[in-house]
């Protein structure tokens, strides 16, 4: 057993039938001696008398809030939670795995820039009850600071007949230096507690793995005299780090129409124009991605040929 | 060319050679970023890499204040990978294909420790660590992990000389 | 299966014209740019131009501007090129080439062997 | 337009040899590049696009590296279906240019 926080203990159980289940020593917070009775949740049953309460903790019916009293007066509140483990694994039961870039991903993270500054996000079918705290820092034997705001609720979607939540987090480190190598990841633990079940979440990374640039800004297009071939142009998106001489981003530019399955043009640069043939009913579409490190491909920006 | 003494290296030259080897880096393993190195404790055996650091003034504002400083942190970088991509972890079992960029990378980084440092002048280079895996899935992962760190080292080398090229330049 | 039939090997003279044909089946032309490349013998390749038989816009290589003329049948999903003033310099194996993409070739015909005699 | 520049002309090897095509383009062309394959009276046949992109159905032995003006066709040991001329083109800027190509023969 341990402390997630004040009054609030984790105990850790193997999952399995007929398991023994953990023996916990509950003590009232209180100069009090005697007279000191124990009841469970909302139940007026007495389940014990003392300043401490001894259970065996089995099943989630073991788990929950018990409360020390004196005399029909509250003296102190223990919040027992369970963490599952089966067959040696923790249980993973209140988040979606993502799937992406491989199984078993439940956060999932990206950066816009190299600022230190990153949002992390998670999927659950779960709407009620469900609680998450978030903790970071760049290395794990001595850590770094990092702040995490508070996760919130980002997007609903139904898939199906189920409703799925997205929750996300950003977090900040704070003594980000955007030009170093970084030789430490960064740690992410995500505390998830849905009625009496904890569960705990981590990804580790390095910001350059992580990065997607915004897509480019101020896309424009300009014919070229007796010719069907037009220069599209465009600039870094604002977020990008700076200076751009220093943290220099490639692009792709993709004149294609409506269906995946039509002809396209495409090509690849490092400049912030691009000649390409125009088609009716085609737009051109440019990406970018960091141009000495092969993380993601920002989302596509596009403006319609005609 | 960076020689010890403070002169300018050949900003354009390095860009290129740069951003060559950051190609090559990707080409020699392209898959190892679909593979969570970090789960087979890394500790031991990249922890000993030259890593371009915060203090180390290769950041804009460090490369107009002093680019010397910088330019001899990616000399030392280049010269322990070149050591490396020629040790024993490479030229051992299981045996890399002749042609494979892992060859080319390794003259491109002697190459741009060259154009950096010319015969004569010698900066100290950093001792590499004796690590000599015994089984050839060792040396394979052992790789993957140098090769990792490689691809992030010259990343920022080839920020630092096209910023160079762009604005440090004669 | 994707393929392109082009027409057989031709013997012209000297100053004359001719027109390749290029036919496609498993596919339709409309959906694809077309493309003709020539090869002369013991030779590299030469991009000659590409058509978008969708809408009959063209693309030539400045060598070939005035030299060649690209043309496309969508109802007999057939793509021409007609070479004129022809001298010794055409002669040469003249590929068609499909592709959905505009800037590389995919499908290939099996080419034209055009021989220009004086 | 832009010059491409293969070496070697000629590549004279044994099967089951590696081997390593080069193509230098006059000017930097990001990754617009791409390798074919022409076997004796035969069309053309893409092997790779965009510098390393591999193509379906090409076997596995074939890859490509490089970006700006430096391309590598590599060929992981050689089989005698392997042997004729190989050709990169750029899809830069027009004219799309070939370079001149470079023949491997049998030793």
């Known amino acids: 057993i341990w402390e997630l926080k004040k009054d609030v203990y984790v105990v850790e159980l193997d999952w399995y039938p007929d398991a023994p289940g953990e023996m916990v020593v509950l003590t009232c917070d209180t100069p009090e001696e005697d007279g000191i009775t124990w009841t469970l949740d909302q139940s007026s049953e007495v389940l014990g008398s003392g300043k401490t309460l001894t259970i065996q903790v089995k099943e989630f019916g073991d788990a929950g809030q018990y409360t020390c009293h004196k005399g029909g007066e509250v003296l102190s509140h223990s919040l027992l939670l369970l963490h599952k483990k089966e067959d040696g694994i923790w249980s993973t039961d209140i988040l979606k795995d993502q799937k992406e870039p491989k199984n078993k991903t439940f956060l999932r993270c990206e950066a816009k820039n190299y600022s230190g500054r990153f949002t992390c996000w998670w999927l659950t079918t779960i709407s009620t009850d469900l609680t998450f705290s978030v903790k970071s820092s760049r290395g794990s034997s001595d850590p770094q600071g990092v702040t995490c705001g508070a996760a919130t609720l980002s997007a609903e979607r139904v898939r199906g007949d189920n409703k799925e939540y997205e929750y996300s987090v950003e977090c900040q480190e704070d003594s980000a230096c955007p030009a170093a190598e970084e030789s430490l990841p960064i740690e992410v633990m995500v505390d998830a507690v849905h009625k009496l079940k904890y569960e705990n979440y981590t990804s580790s990374f390095f910001i350059r793995d992580i990065i997607k640039p915004d897509p480019p800004k101020n896309l424009q297009l300009k014919p070229l005299k007796n010719s069907r071939q037009v220069e599209v142009s465009w600039e870094y998106p604002d977020t990008w780090s700076t200076p751009h001489s220093y943290f220099s981003l490639t692009f792709c530019v993709q004149v294609q129409g409506k269906s995946k399955r039509e002809k396209k043009d495409r090509v690849f640069t490092d400049k912030t124009s691009a000649t390409v043939i125009c088609r009716k009913n085609a737009s051109i579409s440019v990406r970018a991605q960091d141009r000495y490190y092969s993380s993601s491909w920002s989302e596509w920006a596009s403006v319609p040929c005609s | 060319r960076a020689v010890p003494g403070g002169s300018s290296p050949a900003w354009t030259q390095c860009q290129q050679l740069s951003q060559k080897l950051c190609t090559l880096a990707w080409s020699a393993h392209p898959l190892v970023g679909h593979m969570d190195l970090r789960e087979e404790g890394d500790e031991e055996t990249t922890n000993d890499v030259p890593h371009i650091q915060c203090g180390d003034g290769c950041d804009p504002q460090g490369l107009r204040d002093n680019s010397q400083f910088c330019l001899q942190r990616i000399h030392q970088g280049l010269i322990f990978y070149e050591k490396l991509l020629g040790s024993d972890i490479f030229t051992g079992e299981p045996s890399l294909l002749p042609d494979s960029p892992v060859g080319q990378l390794h003259a491109s980084l002697l190459g741009l420790s060259q154009l950096l440092q010319p015969e004569g002048h010698h900066w100290e280079t950093q001792q590499i660590p004796s690590l000599s895996p015994s089984q050839p899935w060792q040396r394979l992962l052992l790789r993957f992990k140098i090769l990792r760190s490689l691809q992030a080292f010259v990343a920022v080398a080839a920020r630092v000389f096209a910023h160079g090229a762009a604005t440090l330049s004669p | 299966e994707v393929q392109l039939q082009q027409s057989g090997a031709d013997l012209v003279r000297s100053g004359a014209s001719i027109k390749l044909s290029c036919t496609a089946s498993?596919?339709?032309?409309?959906?694809?740019?077309m493309h003709w490349v020539k090869q002369r013998p013991e030779q590299g390749l030469e991009w000659i131009g590409w058509?978008?038989?969708?809408?009959?816009?063209?693309e030539y290589a400045p060598k070939f501007q005035g030299k060649a003329t690209m043309t496309a049948d969508t109802s007999s999903n057939t793509a021409y090129l007609q070479l004129s003033s022809l001298t010794s310099e055409d002669t040469a194996v003249y590929y068609c080439?499909?592709?959905?993409?505009?800037?590389?070739?995919?499908?290939w015909g099996a080419g034209t062997t055009v021989t220009v005699s004086s | 337009d832009i010059v491409l520049t293969q070496s070697p002309a000629t590549l004279s090897v044994t099967p089951g040899d590696s081997v390593s095509l080069s193509c230098r383009a006059s000017q930097s062309i990001s990754i617009n590049l791409h390798w074919y394959q022409q076997k004796s009276h035969e069309s053309p046949r893409l092997l790779i696009k965009?510098?390393?992109q591999s193509i379906s159905g090409i076997p596995s032995r074939f890859s490509g590296y490089g970006s700006g003006t430096d391309f590598t066709l590599s060929i992981n040991s050689v089989e005698t279906e392997d042997f004729g001329r190989y050709f990169c083109q750029q899809s830069n800027s027009w004219p799309l240019t070939f370079g001149a190509g470079t023949k491997l023969e049998l030793k």
């Open positions: 498993g596919f339709n032309i409309k959906d694809y740019y």
């Open positions: 080439n499909a592709h959905k993409e505009l800037r590389y070739f995919d499908v």
């Open positions: 058509i978008d038989p969708e809408n009959g816009d063209t």
């Open positions: 965009f510098a390393s």
